[in-house]
Interface confidence: low
C-alpha cells in the first residue's frame, strides 16, 4: 500500500530512509536536456523474495538531442556532486542496509540521473531526520517517522525534532552547548542516535543524507 | 525468472465464451507488462492482447477488440483472458507472455519484446 503523503517536513532539517521496503518506487528521472529512453521504464521498484530484495530495472537516459546514450555507467566524481546531497561525518557506520530482510540499499546513481530523487513509499517505510548544517537538534525525542495505515487510510507519525540555529542559546537545563567537530559542524548534526522501532536496532543516521524532498506523487 | 502456466483453453462452439488464465510464479511479475499472443496452424504467431504492470493501459488486436478482454490480479500472480463471442478464426494456441523490460512505460504488441513464455494453451471454436 503506498502512503499517500509525503514525510512531514521539519524546519530546517531533512530526511532520508535508511532503507527502502519491498514495494517502493523510484522515478527514473533524468537531468535537463536527457530524456527516458524510449520503452524504458518510469520506476524502479524495490522487489524480492524472503530472502533477497533488490530494485528491479534500471533507469537509462539518453540525450535529447540524440538516440544513442543508453549505456548503464557509474557517474563519474563531477557527475555526482551534482546530486543533491550534504555529507555528514559520522563515528560510526550507519544500519547495513543489505542486513534488512524485505528491504532495499540505496539504489545506485545512473548516468545522467536527474539531481532529486522522487520515491514513492510504502506503509511500514520509516525515514529518519537530521538538522541540516548550520542547526544542532535541540529535542532529543524520536528523530524518525513512519508511515502507518490507520483506519484505512495512510498518515506519517510526527518526529520529535527541533533544529535550531547555532547562533541561537536557547537550551534544554543542563544541556551544554555543543563542541564543534573537526569538520566544523555541531556535535548534535553529527552523532544523533536514534532508535528504530522498525528494525529494533540503535543506529546512527546515515553518513548521506538527501536535501531534496521525495515526494509520494502517484500518478 | 518469471514462470508462466497457462489454462482454461478447449473446445467451444462458434459464439461461445472461454476464459483462459495465466499462472506466474517468480519475484518479478508484478513489474511487467503482460500479453496474450496465439499462433494458429500454419500461422505467424500473432498478438492478441496486453496489460500493463499498473493495469492502467491495456491493448488490443483490432481482430479481438469488443470481444476480448484482459485483466490481470497482482495479488494472485494471475492473468486472465476473457474471450467472448467465439470466431472459428479464434482457433489456435494461446500464449502468455511477459515483456522483457521492467515497469515498461510502453505497451508493445511485438513477441520479440516478451523475454518470457509459457507452454501455450490450445483453443479450438467449432462452427
Known amino acids: 500500500e503506498l502512503c499517500d503523503d509525503d514525510p512531514p517536513e521539519i524546519p530546517h532539517a531533512t530526511f532520508k530512509a535508511m532503507a527502502y521496503k519491498e514495494g517502493t518506487m523510484l522515478n527514473c528521472e533524468c537531468k535537463r536536456g536527457f530524456r527516458r529512453i524510449k520503452s524504458g521504464s518510469l520506476y524502479m521498484l524495490c522487489t524480492g523474495n524472503s530472502s533477497h530484495s533488490s530494485w528491479d530495472n534500471q533507469c537509462q537516459c539518453t540525450s535529447s538531442a540524440t538516440r544513442n546514450t543508453t549505456k548503464q555507467v557509474t557517474p563519474q566524481p563531477e557527475e555526482q556532486k551534482e546530486r543533491k546531497t550534504t555529507e555528514m561525518q559520522s563515528p560510526m557506520q550507519p544500519v547495513d542496509q543489505a542486513s534488512l530482510p524485505g528491504h532495499c540499499r540505496e539504489p545506485p546513481p545512473w548516468e545522467n540521473e536527474a539531481t532529486e530523487r522522487i520515491y514513492h513509499f510504502v506503509v511500514g517505510q520509516m525515514v529518519y531526520y537530521q538538522c541540516v548544517q548550520g542547526y544542532r537538534a535541540l529535542h532529543r525525542g524520536p528523530a524518525e517517522s513512519v508511515c502507518k495505515m490507520t483506519h484505512g487510510k495512510t498518515r506519517w507519525t510526527q518526529p520529535q525534532l527541533i533544529c535550531t540555529g547555532e547562533m541561537e542559546t536557547s537550551q534544554f537545563p543542563g544541556e551544554e552547548k555543543p563542541q564543534a567537530s573537526p569538520e566544523g559542524r555541531p556535535e548534535s548534526e553529527t552523532s544523533c542516535l536514534v532508535t528504530t522501532t522498525d528494525f529494533q536496532i540503535q543506529t546512527e543516521m546515515a553518513a548521506t543524507m538527501e536535501t531534496s524532498i521525495f515526494t509520494t506523487e502517484y500518478q | 525468472q518469471v514462470q508462466l502456466v497457462e489454462s482454461g483453453g478447449g473446445l467451444v462452439q462458434a459464439g461461445g465464451s472461454l476464459r483462459l488464465s495465466c499462472a506466474a510464479s517468480g519475484g518479478t511479475f508484478r513489474t511487467r507488462n503482460m500479453g496474450w499472443f496465439r499462433r494458429a496452424p500454419g500461422k505467424e504467431r500473432e498478438f492478441v492482447a496486453a496489460?500493463?504492470?499498473?493495469?492502467?493501459?491495456?491493448l488490443y488486436a483490432g481482430s479481438v477488440k469488443g470481444r476480448f478482454t484482459i485483466s490481470r490480479d497482482n495479488g494472485r500472480n494471475m492473468v486472465y483472458l476473457q474471450m467472448n463471442s467465439l470466431k472459428p478464426e479464434d482457433t489456435a494456441v494461446y500464449y502468455c507472455?511477459?515483456?522483457?523490460?521492467?515497469?515498461?512505460?510502453?505497451?508493445?504488441?511485438?513477441?520479440?519484446?516478451?523475454?518470457?513464455w509459457g507452454q501455450g494453451t490450445q483453443v479450438t471454436v467449432s462452427s
Open positions: 507472455a511477459a515483456d522483457n523490460i521492467p515497469l515498461s512505460s510502453d505497451m508493445r504488441p511485438t513477441a520479440t519484446e516478451y523475454d518470457y
Open positions: 496489460v500493463s504492470w499498473n493495469v492502467d493501459n491495456k
